[in-house]
Interface confidence: low
């Protein structure tokens, strides 16, 4: 008996071939001997089966002795043995219809679990193997679970169902709802405008939800909500904003926040959360702000940074075009009695300059002592 695998919702074509290459009488029946369809001369006739409106044949092939049964919009319950009767012979074809669905929405938050459920006909014992967009293979029986979805899991999952040495392939598009970056860091000189961007790693037609940016300033004992906003069909509207600092927010995606000026008291780290409508859980992106200030007070030239810097970052003070006068893995460096000229304060990581602030030191003229 020939075995054919079909996919729920698809169309399948079961073949039946006569030895004579001409149009002769045929009919298709199911295992209960109920007629599905056949012919009467050049006309297609249909029987009383439940497939009635979904069954068809290809009349253009009849003259070649081919009498296929086409079943559209397959259902799991269409799984059956189909019999083609032609020229006093019977051809049996076993059709097994499988369905593979994500047990929840195919739009899932980063960190959530994906469960794929296989619908199969009674008596079948299929095995399933799925390959994620990043090439990870998972195997299972009636259900497959992937916990802790990552951004790289977004895309087309290809799942192969094996039964009776035959296979059928399913493709499921999964969208992992996440920000493009889990964390970002912005380096700014004191007084500069700060732009925070929170691009999403997915696109959907309608996006509705609400969000909030909590900020933990390095100097503050507790975190503070800087801004809350709503998202309606990709339009952003601010609900509440602190008076200090006064953030501005773009009205369109990607989410974009502007801090009028970087000040030491704002240096720290923030967590932007986005709760999407009809989704449990929230999207998160961490953002960090490092602020640099170079100052000269009397005979002391100081460079300081505030905010979350890694211990391997180097802070240096150097006269332009000269070797660094002082270079430390600390958050403040200074030079006493600096020479006149343009001094540079540099924050660097393995030789790569992350932030630079210039300060001009003027010559000091000694006042002559009066006799």
């Amino acid at each position: 008996k020939k075995v054919v695998l079909g996919k729920k919702g698809d169309t399948v074509e079961l073949t039946c071939t006569a030895s004579q290459k001409k149009s002769i009488q045929f009919h298709w029946k199911n295992s209960n001997q109920i007629k599905i369809l056949g012919n009467q001369g050049s006309f297609l006739t249909k029987g009383p089966s439940k497939l009635n409106d979904r069954a068809d044949s290809r009349r253009s092939l009849w003259d070649q002795g081919n009498f296929p049964l086409i079943i559209k919009n397959l259902k799991i319950e269409d799984s059956d043995t189909y019999i083609c009767e032609v020229e006093d012979q019977k051809e049996e074809v076993q059709l097994l219809v499988f369905g593979l669905t994500a047990n929840s929405d195919t739009h899932l938050l980063q960190g959530q679990s994906l469960t794929l459920t296989l619908e199969s006909p009674p008596g079948s014992s299929p095995s399933v193997q799925c390959r994620s967009p990043r090439g990870k293979n998972i195997q299972g029986g009636k259900t497959l679970s992937v916990s802790q979805l990552e951004l790289q899991d977004s895309g087309t999952w290809t799942c192969t169902v094996l039964q009776n040495q035959k296979k059928v392939e399913f493709k499921i598009d999964i969208v992992v709802l996440a920000f493009q970056k889990a964390s970002s860091i912005v380096y700014k000189k004191e007084g500069e405008q700060v732009e925070f961007s929170f691009p999403l790693a997915f696109t959907v037609e309608k996006l509705t939800g609400s969000g909030e940016l909590w900020w933990q300033a390095e100097r503050a004992s507790s975190s503070k909500s800087w801004i809350t906003f709503d998202l309606k069909n990709k339009e952003v509207s601010v609900k509440r904003v602190t008076q200090d600092p006064k953030l501005q927010m773009g009205k369109k995606l990607p989410l974009h926040l502007t801090l009028p000026q970087a000040l030491p008291q704002y240096a720290g780290s923030g967590n932007l959360t986005l709760a999407l409508e009809a989704k449990t859980g929230k999207l998160h992106q961490e953002v960090n702000l490092v602020v640099m200030r170079a100052t000269q007070l009397q005979k002391n030239l100081t460079c300081e940074v505030w905010g979350p810097t890694s211990p391997k970052l180097m802070l240096s003070l150097k006269l332009e075009n000269k070797e660094a006068k002082v270079s430390k893995r600390e958050k403040a460096v200074w030079v006493l009695n600096p020479e006149a000229g343009m001094w540079q304060c540099l924050l660097s990581d393995s030789g790569q300059v992350l932030l630079e602030s210039n300060i001009k030191v003027l010559p000091t003229w000694s006042t002559p002592v009066q006799p």
Partner: antibody
């Protein structure tokens, strides 16, 4: 901080008009420019706003097919074009900017207004 | 309300504004008040229900929360003859009240 608007306009029904709002005294790209309509002897109606920094705009649903907002960063000027004018569009149009800190959600700075008269 | 109001010089003028829904959020009321004189643009008087804008005389004060707000002017002066508008800024699009015309007797 000043917002200087262009002069009065007399236009025919069906035509279009483009008015300007030149900002000075602050960093133009840091603040949103809003536009507000006031028909003679009537109240105020918010039309929309534009972010000069990014060029992104946002409109009152009732008026979004009427107005088009643009901004030119090089000249610190915001523009509003009104199309398919009818007598209903005869009004004074103000540009306005919100404040800073506490008054950041109120219109603290206003242009002097541009009078548009639609008449055959 | 009211649409117009006549108050004697030196007396108190009270103008009310009722929002169709609450304009409060997290302890703040997003209601602003403006004064507009003929041929001039509106001028911000009060922001966030009760905060006096810089440069505005202390005889102007605002109060209220939720849906009911009041602008008080006391004592009224000649130069206060104008139309006064309330405006909510909690929800886009922001909307203005119909205005109250104040006449000084």
């Amino acid at each position: 901080i000043q917002l200087q608007q262009s002069g009065p306009e007399l236009v025919k029904p069906g035509a279009s008009v483009k008015m300007s709002c030149k900002a000075s005294g602050y960093t133009f790209t840091d603040y949103v420019i809003n536009w507000v309509k006031q028909r003679t002897g009537q109240g105020l109606e918010w039309i929309g706003e534009i972010y000069p920094g990014s060029g992104s705009d946002y409109y009152n649903e009732n008026l979004k097919d009427k107005a088009t907002l643009t901004a030119d960063k090089s000249s610190n000027t915001a523009y509003m074009q009104l199309s398919s004018l009818t007598s209903e569009d005869s009004a004074v149009y103000f540009c306005a900017r919100k404040g800073e800190n506490g008054n950041s959600l109120a219109f603290a700075y206003w242009g002097q207004g541009t009078l548009v008269t639609v008449s055959a | 309300s009211p649409a117009s109001l006549a108050v004697s010089l030196g007396q108190r003028a009270t103008i009310s504004c009722k929002a169709s829904q609450s304009v409060d959020y997290d302890g703040d009321s997003y209601m602003n008040w403006y004064q507009q004189k003929s041929g001039q643009p509106p001028k911000l008087l009060i922001y966030a229900a009760s905060n006096l804008e810089s440069g505005i005389p202390a005889r102007f004060s605002g109060s209220g929360s939720g849906t009911d707000f009041t602008l008080n002017i006391h004592p009224v002066e000649e130069e206060d003859a104008a139309t006064y508008y309330c405006q909510q800024s909690i929800q886009d699009p922001c909307t203005f009240g119909g205005g109250t015309e104040l006449e000084i007797k």
